[in-house]
C-alpha cells in the first residue's frame, strides 16, 4: 500500500514536472523524455486498482443540472430570450471549439485562462471563452457589416472559480450585440436598456449598472502620466476598486507594478469618482481631462449616452464609475457592467456591490483583427451572466421553500377499477395526438391512491380518470388535483375543458 | 538475486581508455533507466551519465561530454561506459545503478564499485 | 546546476538518539530529493525517495520531510548499524547533484 502511495506521489511529482516544462517551453526533447517517463510511472501504477480508486464526479468548475435546476434556468432563459426577441435580434450559433489563433491575443491577461484541446495531429484548438469574439470571428469570415444578434452558449474557462457564487469553468453565456455604422451611442444605450429590462423582469434584486468609457480611462490615464506599456495592467488594479479599498489598490499600482506615488495618487483623484450625467458636465470642464482628445470623445459620447437613457426611463440605474475597467483587452468605447445592491445595513449608508450579474461594451477593433484589410465593423452588445443569476433564483426559492414544477403535464391518464390499461392508452394517446402534455403511470393496474399521490408530488394539475361506468356513459372523469372536485365530461369535450382549465390556446398552431 | 556488478576498472595513463561494464540480473533489465555514479577516493557521489531502458535517451555531466560514451545491451543485460581521453581527474570508483521506479533519477539498485586509476 | 549543501558536515550521537539533517537545495526542487547511507568500502543504500518516501526495507526509524528547498532526514532513535555518511541527492533536473555528506559518528 506504501509502495502505490509513493508510486501515486512520484506520478504526480512527474505530472506537475511535464506541466512546468510545457509552460517553460522547454525543448521539444526534454518535454518527450518526461512525458515517457511519466506514462512508464503510470503504467506501473495499473490499471486494475486506480479504477476501484476512481471517484465518480463532474470535472473541477462544472456540474450537473437536476430538473429543479433546469426548471429554474429555463425560466431565467425564457426571460432573456423574450426580451432579445422583442428588440428584434436573430440568432446565431459557432462550434464550441476554434482555431487557437482565432483567440489568442484578443483577451490580455486573461489568455491564461483559455482551453487547450489536446493536438490530434491536426489543427490547434481552445475551447471558445467567450461569445465576443467567435461572433467576431463569424462577422469578418461572412464579410457581414450589420446584424443585430443573439447567442446563447456554454464558455470554457480554467480559471479556479468559487462555485458557491455562482462561478464555473464551464458556464452559460447570454449575449446580445449589435455590429454595425450607426448614429453614436444610439445602439449603445438600448444594449443599456435590455439590460436593465432583464434584470428588472427577473427580480432578483435591486440592481445598478456602472457605466465608463475606455477612452476616458486611456486619457485619465495619460494626464496621469501612466506610460502606455502600463495602460492595460493598471486598468487592471483599478478595476478592483469594487472589491478592495484605495489603499490596496494604490499599494498594488506603487508596489508591484512600478508606478510612481504621485502618479498613482493622481489617478486614485479620478477613479475614486462616480456619479450620474452632472460628473460627465463636471469632468468636461476639468481643465487636464478636457485637453485630452480622447478622453473629450469618451465623455461627450457619455453625455449623449445619458441623454438617451433618460428617454429609455433608465438613467436612474446608471452611475458614471471612473474606477469600471473592464478586463478584457477589445474594449475600445462605452463599457458597463451591472451590480447587484445589498440592501444596506443603516439607511444613508452606500449600497453595497454583490457582484457582476451583466456586463459589455463596445468593441469597434475586434472584426478588424480578423479582416484581412483590416476593414473594422462597430460593435456594441452586452453579456448577461446567468450562471450567478441562476444561484441566487435558487437560493431565493430555496429560501422561500417554493415548490418548482420540473414537468409540463397537464393531465394524468389514470385508472380507478384494474383491467382498464388498453383504455388508458387509448385515451393519452388521443390526448398526445390534440397537443395535450400528458403521463400515465407504467402499470396495468396501479391503486388510484398512487396516481393522485404522483400528481400531488409532480404538480400536475389535472387527472382524468376512466372507470367502468364511466366507459358505459361516454365520459370521463376530470378531477382537479388540488380542489378534489370531480366533473364529468363528454370524451369529445375533454381536449377542449383541459385547455380552458390549463390556459392553453385551443388550436395548436 | 537482484543484483549489479561492475567490472573493468584498472590503472590507466592520462589520455588512456577503458571500458567499464555492469552485469545485471533477477530483474527485467530493459524496463529501466541505468546510470553511471562516481565517487573520487574521500569525496562525494557525483552523477556521470544516465541511458533509458529504450536506448532512446542519454546524458553526460559536462565534466565527460565527448570523452565518455554510456551504452547498453538489453539482450546481454549489461551496461557499459567507454572511457577515452582519461585524466587524472577521473580516478574514482565508478558505480552503476538502476533508476528507482524505472525511471526516477534515483539509484533503488548499486553494484559494490569499480576503481578506475588514472596516473601517470 | 543545482547545488545541494547539507549541514552539518559531521555529527556525533549516541545509541538511541534523535538526529536531523538538512540539506538545502540552491534552487525549488519540489518532492524530487532523495537520501542516502553509506558505509565505507561500500555502495551507498537508498532510504528516501520523493522527500518523504521510505524505499522499501528500510527501518521506520528513518523519516524525510520537507519540499522546495529545505528538505531533513531523522533518525528516530540511533541504532549500532547506523552509524554512517549521509548524502541528499535532488532529482529535479540534470545534472543530478548530490550534497557533500553529513558524517554519522558515536559520540
Known amino acids: 500500500m506504501a509502495e502505490r502511495a509513493a508510486l501515486e506521489e512520484l506520478v504526480k511529482l512527474q505530472g506537475e514536472r511535464v506541466r512546468g516544462l510545457k509552460q517553460q517551453k522547454a525543448s521539444a526533447e526534454l518535454i518527450e523524455e518526461e512525458v515517457a517517463k511519466l506514462l512508464k510511472l503510470k503504467a506501473q501504477l495499473g490499471p486494475d486498482e486506480s479504477k476501484q480508486k476512481f471517484v465518480l464526479k463532474t470535472p473541477k468548475g462544472t456540474r450537473d443540472y437536476s430538473p429543479r435546476q433546469m426548471a429554474v434556468r429555463e425560466k431565467v432563459f425564457d426571460v432573456i430570450i423574450r426580451c432579445f426577441k422583442r428588440h428584434g435580434a436573430e440568432v446565431i450559433d459557432t462550434p464550441v471549439f476554434e482555431l487557437k489563433e482565432t483567440l489568442m491575443g484578443k483577451y490580455g491577461e486573461d489568455s491564461k485562462l483559455i482551453y487547450d484541446l489536446k493536438d490530434q495531429g491536426g489543427e490547434l484548438l481552445s475551447l471558445r471563452y467567450d461569445l465576443t469574439v467567435p461572433f467576431a470571428r463569424y462577422l469578418a469570415m461572412n464579410k457581414l457589416t450589420n446584424i443585430k444578434r443573439y447567442h446563447i452558449a456554454k464558455v470554457y474557462r480554467r480559471d479556479n472559480p468559487a462555485m458557491t457564487r455562482g462561478r464555473y469553468r464551464e458556464f452559460y453565456q447570454c449575449d446580445f450585440d449589435i455590429a454595425g455604422n450607426f448614429d453614436p451611442m444610439i445602439p449603445d444605450a438600448e444594449c443599456l436598456k435590455i439590460m436593465c429590462e432583464i434584470l428588472s423582469s427577473l427580480q432578483i434584486g435591486d440592481f445598478l449598472v456602472k457605466v465608463n468609457d475606455r477612452r476616458i480611462l486611456d486619457g485619465m490615464f495619460a494626464i496621469c502620466g501612466v506610460s502606455d506599456s502600463k495602460f492595460r495592467t493598471i486598468c487592471s488594479s483599478v478595476d478592483k476598486l469594487d472589491k478592495v479599498s484605495w489603499e490596496e489598490v494604490k499599494n498594488e499600482m506603487v508596489g508591484e507594478k512600478g508606478l510612481a506615488p504621485e502618479v498613482a495618487d493622481r489617478i486614485g483623484d479620478y477613479v475614486q469618482q462616480h456619479g450620474g450625467v452632472s460628473l460627465v458636465e463636471q469632468l468636461l470642464q476639468d481643465p487636464k481631462l478636457s485637453q485630452n482628445k480622447q478622453a473629450l470623445e469618451g465623455l461627450g459620447d457619455l453625455k449623449l449616452l445619458f441623454e438617451y437613457l433618460t428617454l429609455f426611463g433608465i438613467d436612474d440605474k446608471i452611475s458614471f464609475d471612473l474606477s469600471l475597467a473592464r478586463g478584457l483587452d477589445y474594449y475600445t468605447g462605452v463599457i458597463y457592467e451591472a451590480v447587484l445592491l445589498q440592501t444596506p445595513a443603516q439607511a444613508g449608508e452606500e449600497p453595497l456591490g454583490v457582484g457582476s450579474v451583466a456586463a459589455g461594451g463596445r468593441y469597434d477593433g475586434l472584426v478588424g483583427m480578423f479582416d484581412p484589410k483590416g476593414r473594422k465593423v462597430p460593435c456594441v452588445g452586452l453579456s448577461i451572466g446567468v450562471e450567478r443569476i441562476f444561484s441566487i433564483v435558487e437560493q431565493r426559492l430555496e429560501a422561500l421553500e417554493e415548490k418548482i414544477r420540473t414537468t409540463e403535464t397537464q393531465v394524468l391518464v389514470a385508472s380507478a377499477q384494474k383491467k382498464l390499461l388498453e383504455e388508458r392508452l387509448k385515451l393519452v394517446s388521443e390526448l398526445w395526438d390534440a397537443g395535450i402534455k400528458a403521463e400515465l403511470l407504467y402499470k396495468k393496474n396501479p391503486k388510484l391512491l398512487n396516481q393522485l399521490q404522483y400528481c400531488e408530488e409532480a404538480g400536475i394539475p389535472l387527472v382524468a380518470i376512466i372507470g367502468e361506468q364511466e366507459l358505459k356513459d361516454g365520459v370521463i372523469k376530470l378531477r382537479s388535483v388540488t380542489s378534489r372536485e370531480e366533473v364529468d365530461v363528454r370524451r369529445e369535450d375533454l381536449v377542449e375543458e383541459i385547455k380552458r382549465r390549463t390556459g392553453q390556446p385551443l388550436c395548436i398552431c | 538475486q537482484v543484483q549489479l556488478v561492475e567490472s573493468g576498472g584498472g590503472l590507466v595513463k592520462p589520455g588512456g581508455s577503458l571500458r567499464l561494464s555492469c552485469a545485471a540480473s533477477?530483474?527485467?533489465?530493459?524496463?529501466?533507466?541505468m546510470t553511471w555514479i562516481r565517487q573520487a577516493p574521500g569525496k562525494g557521489l557525483e552523477w556521470v551519465s544516465y541511458i533509458s531502458g529504450s536506448f532512446r535517451y542519454t546524458n553526460y555531466a559536462d565534466k565527460v561530454k565527448g570523452r565518455f560514451t554510456i551504452s547498453r545491451d538489453n539482450a546481454k543485460n549489461s551496461l557499459y561506459l567507454q572511457m577515452n581521453s582519461l585524466r587524472d581527474e577521473d580516478t574514482a570508483v565508478y558505480f552503476c545503478a538502476r533508476y528507482v521506479y524505472q525511471v526516477v533519477a534515483i539509484g533503488d539498485l548499486w553494484g559494490q564499485g569499480t576503481l578506475v586509476t588514472v596516473s601517470s | 546546476d543545482i547545488q545541494m549543501t547539507q549541514s552539518p558536515s559531521s555529527v556525533s550521537a549516541s545509541v538511541g538518539d534523535r538526529v536531523t539533517i538538512t540539506c538545502r537545495a540552491s534552487?525549488?526542487?519540489?518532492?524530487?530529493l532523495a537520501w542516502y547511507q553509506q558505509k565505507p568500502g561500500r555502495a551507498p543504500k537508498l532510504l528516501i525517495f520523493?522527500?518523504?518516501s521510505l524505499q522499501s526495507g528500510v527501518p521506520s526509524r528513518f523519516s524525510g520531510s520537507g519540499s522546495g528547498t529545505h528538505f531533513t532526514l531523522t533518525i528516530s532513535s540511533l541504532q549500532p548499524e547506523d552509524f554512517a555518511t549521509y548524502y541528499c541527492q535532488q532529482a529535479e533536473s540534470f545534472p543530478y547533484t548530490f550534497g557533500q555528506g553529513t558524517k554519522l559518528e558515536i559520540k
Open positions: 520523493a522527500a518523504s
Open positions: 534552487q525549488g526542487i519540489s518532492s524530487w
Open positions: 533477477g530483474f527485467t533489465f530493459s524496463d529501466y533507466y
